[in-house]
Structure formats: C-alpha cells, structure tokens
C-alpha cells in the first residue's frame, strides 16, 4: 500500500508536461511502475511509464498535449497516483493532490546568442521557452558567467528581478573566453523552483586595441 | 464493493455552517485517499479537499479557511466541515474514495447543498 518512506515529488512546466519523480527505499527494480494523472475538471486521463534514475529511484515526464498547449489552469488539481504492477493489478504506491500553479518549474531558457561584444562587456539574450501567458511578466532570472580558472559552481549569481530577456555584462577582461547561463522561475507557487540552468553559451572579449591602456 | 452512505446537505443561509459526512461500508484505513467533490448546476465537477492515507490533506482555493476535511478511521467515516457558506457553493457534493489498487474508486450517492437567503 501506500509506503510512508517513499517521496513522490512533481512539477508542472506551465504548459503541457507534468515530471515526476519517485524514490522509495526497498522498491523492486523489476516491478513496472506508472504515474497515473487525473484532472478533477477535465475528461482526460494521463500515464507515463516511471524509469530508474537512480538506485531507487525512478522519474517521468506526463506529456498532455502539444508543447505550447496550455493544459492546465490555476484552478485545476490533479490526483497523481504513483501504480506499480502486482500480478494482473496496479497497486497505490504513492499518491498526491496536485495543484499544477503552486508547484511550478520552467523549461531552461533557449536561443542564447551574443547581441554585441566588446573588450570589457557583453551584452547577451534569451528566450524563455513554453512559458505560459498566465504570468505576463510575473517572472525572475538568475544568471552567471564561468571565468577562466573557476567553476560554476563559483561563479557569482545574477538576480533580475523582473522579465527581462537580456544581460549586459560588464568588467570583463579583454580577449577571453567566458560561458554564460541563466535561469527562469515565475514568482507565482508555493512550491515552485527554479528552472534548470541553460546550456552554456561561449563567447570570447573582443582584444584589446594595441597601443591603448587597458 | 465498497459502499460511501453520504449525510448532512440541505438549505442553509448565507454565512451559515453544515457538515457532511461519508460512512463507508468497510475499512478506510488502507483507502490511500478520500475526497469531496462537488458540481454546480452547468459548471465542471470540481474537488473541494482530499485527505490521504497519512494526513496530507489539500483544499480547493475557493473553499480554503472555510473548509475543513476530516477523516475518522474507526468510525470508517470522512467529515466536510462547511463554515461561512456562500451561494457560489451551492452544488452536488460527493463523496469519493481511492482504494489500494488503481480499479478502486468509490463514490458516495451526492447531496445537494443549497446556500440561499
């Protein structure tokens, strides 16, 4: 039956994905598991087949409809059970009353390209990518640039606390290469996160001009 | 067959408290979650609050500070304790319960909550 130890965790991307992902101590690796999703208001039902991530854990991604499509609304809940197969049954492993707005998570941020550069800055943009029209411009970005010799992990983090698809860097150091990312969370959802990071974006200062004091 | 036998409902001024209640024909121990749902005349059915096997318990933002869901394993029974009502919430509520295996889900026969002056 439903097992205290196990965490079943889910996120809605604000358009037509729901993840999951569900860790339980002991779980049979060869059992067949599934999310099963149910709309309190909608006539549709949804499954997607759990696989293992980890030892014992395993993750999904319920897919309800066209990547735009907007699925679900602030006022939807969705019963998510965690079933996995016993003989010819699904048994309830996990289960949880989901409220799509309050546990947001946004696809990483998309099309980063260097608009201009110059020795000591630059300025960069983005696109944010299956976002839903709900939040208008209710939405905050991080970012952070990898200098040479450092980690990301290292590397100082940006705060733009409004919808602001673009980033003048500046204090740069001429002629080196740099890798930017940044990141996308709606300011609306109790238990809402951050997006994951976007795929780095390399660009390298223009030199500096000879003869001139940098 | 798991019976749900619903009680309470009926005609109730605005600002006005009732309570429902849900008595299943077995267990609901192992029931991995209960819920209320309701339907208003020409809208969608809605779910009011749910409460799981170990406690979780969720509520619709319309009815939240208003609503509270209870469940009373040894009288086999889940509460829907109803304060401050609104016309906005007259509607069929029903009862529903999720068992331990997906083909189990349960409801109870509805009953209509009027809330008028």
């Known amino acids: 039956a439903v097992n205290g130890t196990s965490q079943f965790t889910c996120f809605y991307n604000s358009r037509a994905n729901i993840s999951c992902v569900w860790s339980q101590d002991g779980a049979l690796q060869d059992t067949s598991c599934q999310v099963h999703a149910w709309p309190d208001r909608r006539r549709w039902n949804q499954t997607c087949e759990l696989l293992p991530v980890s030892q014992a854990s395993w993750a999904c991604n319920l897919i309800l409809g066209a990547p735009d499509s907007q699925k679900l609304t602030t006022v939807d809940i969705v019963t998510l059970r965690v079933l996995c197969r016993e003989g010819v049954r699904w048994r309830v492993m996990a289960i949880q009353d989901f409220k799509p707005f309050e546990n947001l998570r946004l696809m990483a941020p998309i099309s980063l390209q260097v608009v201009h550069v110059e020795t000591h800055r630059c300025n960069i943009s983005w696109e944010i990518s299956q976002a839903s029209h709900y939040f208008e411009r209710h939405l905050e970005f991080e970012a952070r640039t990898l200098s040479p010799g450092h980690t990301w992990e290292e590397a100082p983090l940006l705060t733009l606390k409004q919808k602001q698809e673009w980033i003048c860097l500046e204090t740069l150091t001429p002629d080196t290469q740099y890798e930017f990312q940044v990141r996308v969370k709606p300011l609306q959802g109790e238990f809402t996160t951050w997006s994951p990071w976007s795929q780095p974006l390399a660009f390298r200062t223009k030199p500096a001009a000879l003869g001139k004091d940098t | 067959q798991v019976q749900l036998q619903q009680f309470g409902g009926g005609l109730v001024q605005p600002g006005g408290s009732l309570t429902l209640s849900c008595v299943a024909s077995e267990s609901i121990s192992e029931m991995s979650r209960m819920a209320w749902y309701r339907q208003a005349p020409g809208k969608q059915r809605e779910l009011v609050a749910s409460?799981?096997?170990?406690?979780?318990?969720v509520y619709a933002d319309a009815v939240k500070g208003r609503f509270t869901i209870s469940r009373d394993n040894t009288k086999n029974t889940v509460y829907l304790q109803m304060n401050s009502l609104k016309p906005e919430d007259t509607a069929v509520y029903r009862c529903n319960a999720l068992g331990t295996w997906s083909d189990e889900t349960y409801w109870g026969q509805g009953t209509l909550v009027t809330v008028s002056s």
């Open positions: 409460i799981t096997m170990h406690g979780g318990v």
